[in-house]
């Protein structure tokens, strides 16, 4: 069998045998080793010697298999953006960031770059559950049956009509999508002015 | 202007081992650079034997790669060559040479050379 | 090893000829060759690169050119410093290897 090519290579189709760990170098029309993440380009191959690698300075990374001369710049996650952090940067991974709670991602470049404020939700509906938080803005929905939600805001959640016979009481007015049950004493008339929830 | 300057014993008993540094002025060792070791026998051609990056990183001539060591001492901004079971056939001017990166991979600035004799 | 040879191996010419000196490797090394000059008791200095790429500070009346396994150094109008032996070298594979020199001196 062939030995396996070491790099630095001689590539007459311009293709490397390992794509990730390697690249295709036009000036000299050889396959040579790229830098591993958390590492740049420190010396450039040539025919006769291979790419040499540096670890990345502090506050700088580099995340894939690469052949760049510089690593990147660490950048903060801009509060004014609506970012908070979730993971420091290291000399493999950018700064991880999300939006602030209360908050959605409204302008994505490949990450998000900036954040807005959640819509509220009135009453009589709740934000649907996303699968990822801060991804997208709120898209309201009606309460289930027997559920009621009373306020307007972007994170309150529908909440189960009160059941008035688990506490000894009798149901006075029936529960809405934007109410709750209003229950009452049994031995007791509701007063037609009365709008508590629970009377005793 | 980058200068290199080699220095070292003169003289090497067979079976000894040849010694040389060459130390690095008007510029960094940690430059992007690659610092070679060539030899020239007396009223012959050059042979190279291999060269470091500052790194660590080293490259040696096959024919010569079971006898050399070639290191790196940044913080004296010098290199070293180390050429084990020396004969008389490595009786050579030796030079120290610096070849940039990513290049045809040329030689472009030399020490002055130093004479090595191997003899009993 | 590729292995390079030169030609002549010596020669003699008058200051203002016009002097070229070959250069051949043992297999194509594309535009990977390098010429140097040498003065007795003195290291070589660069003279050209990859094969016709002047060294800052040298002469124009150094040129070199070829490709693959034929090379060419010219010296247009020899002048008195350029008596010296002159070294091509090739840096295609490892590990680069040099001509045997061509010696200039004077007639």
């Known amino acids: 069998s062939q030995p396996q090519a070491v790099p630095p290579y001689a590539s007459e189709n311009q293709t490397c045998r390992d794509q990730e760990k390697e690249y295709y170098e036009p000036q000299h029309r050889i396959c040579c080793s790229r830098c591993p993440p958390g590492t740049y380009v420190s010396a450039k191959c040539s025919r006769i010697r291979d790419t040499v690698c540096a670890t990345c300075a502090e506050n700088s990374y580099n995340e894939h298999w690469n052949y760049l001369t510089i690593c990147q710049l660490c950048r903060p996650c801009d509060p004014v953006m609506g970012l908070e952090e979730i993971a420091p940067c290291t000399s493999k991974r950018k700064t991880q960031c999300r939006c602030q709670p209360g908050m959605f991602c409204a302008a994505w470049a490949l990450e998000c770059t900036h954040c807005e404020l959640l819509s509220d939700c009135p009453p009589g509906t709740e934000a649907e559950l996303k699968d990822e938080v801060g991804k997208g803005n709120n898209h309201c929905v009606p309460c289930k049956a027997g559920h009621f939600q009373n306020t307007s805001s972007p994170s309150a959640r529908c909440q189960p009509h009160t059941r008035c016979e688990n506490q000894g009481l009798v149901e006075a007015a029936p529960g809405t999508a934007q109410s709750d049950t209003t229950c009452k004493n049994p031995l007791e008339p509701l007063p037609p002015e009365m709008s508590g929830t629970m009377l005793m | 202007q980058v200068q290199l300057q080699e220095s070292g014993p003169g003289l090497v008993k067979p079976s000894g081992t040849l010694s040389l540094t060459c130390a690095v002025s008007?510029?960094?060792?940690?430059?992007?650079?690659?610092w070679s070791w060539v030899r020239q026998p007396p009223g012959k051609g050059l042979e190279w034997i291999g060269d470091?990056?500052?790194?660590?990183?080293?490259y040696y001539n096959p024919s010569l790669k079971s006898r050399v060591t070639v290191s790196v001492d940044k913080s004296k901004n010098q290199f070293s060559l180390k050429l084990s079971s020396v004969t008389a056939a490595d009786t050579a001017v030796y030079y120290c040479?610096?070849?940039?990166?990513?290049?045809?991979?040329?030689?472009?600035?030399w020490g002055q050379g130093t004479l090595v004799t191997v003899s009993s | 090893d590729i292995q390079m040879t030169q030609s002549p191996s010596s020669l003699s010419a008058s200051v203002g000829d016009r002097v070229n000196i070959t250069c051949r490797a043992s297999?194509?090394?594309?535009?990977?060759l390098n010429w140097y000059q040498q003065k007795p008791g003195k290291a070589p200095k660069l003279l050209i690169y990859a094969p016709s790429s002047l060294q800052s500070g040298v002469p124009s009346r150094f040129s070199g050119g070829g490709s693959g396994t034929d090379f060419t150094l010219t010296i247009s109008s020899l002048q008195p410093e350029d008596f010296a032996t002159y070294f091509c070298q090739q840096s295609y594979s490892t590990p680069p290897t040099f001509g045997p020199g061509t010696k200039v001196d004077i007639k």
């Open positions: 297999q194509s090394i594309s535009s990977y």
């Open positions: 008007g510029g960094s060792i940690s430059s992007s650079n690659w």
């Open positions: 470091i990056y500052h790194d660590g990183t080293t």
């Open positions: 040479a610096r070849s940039p990166s990513g290049t045809t991979d040329y030689f472009d600035y």
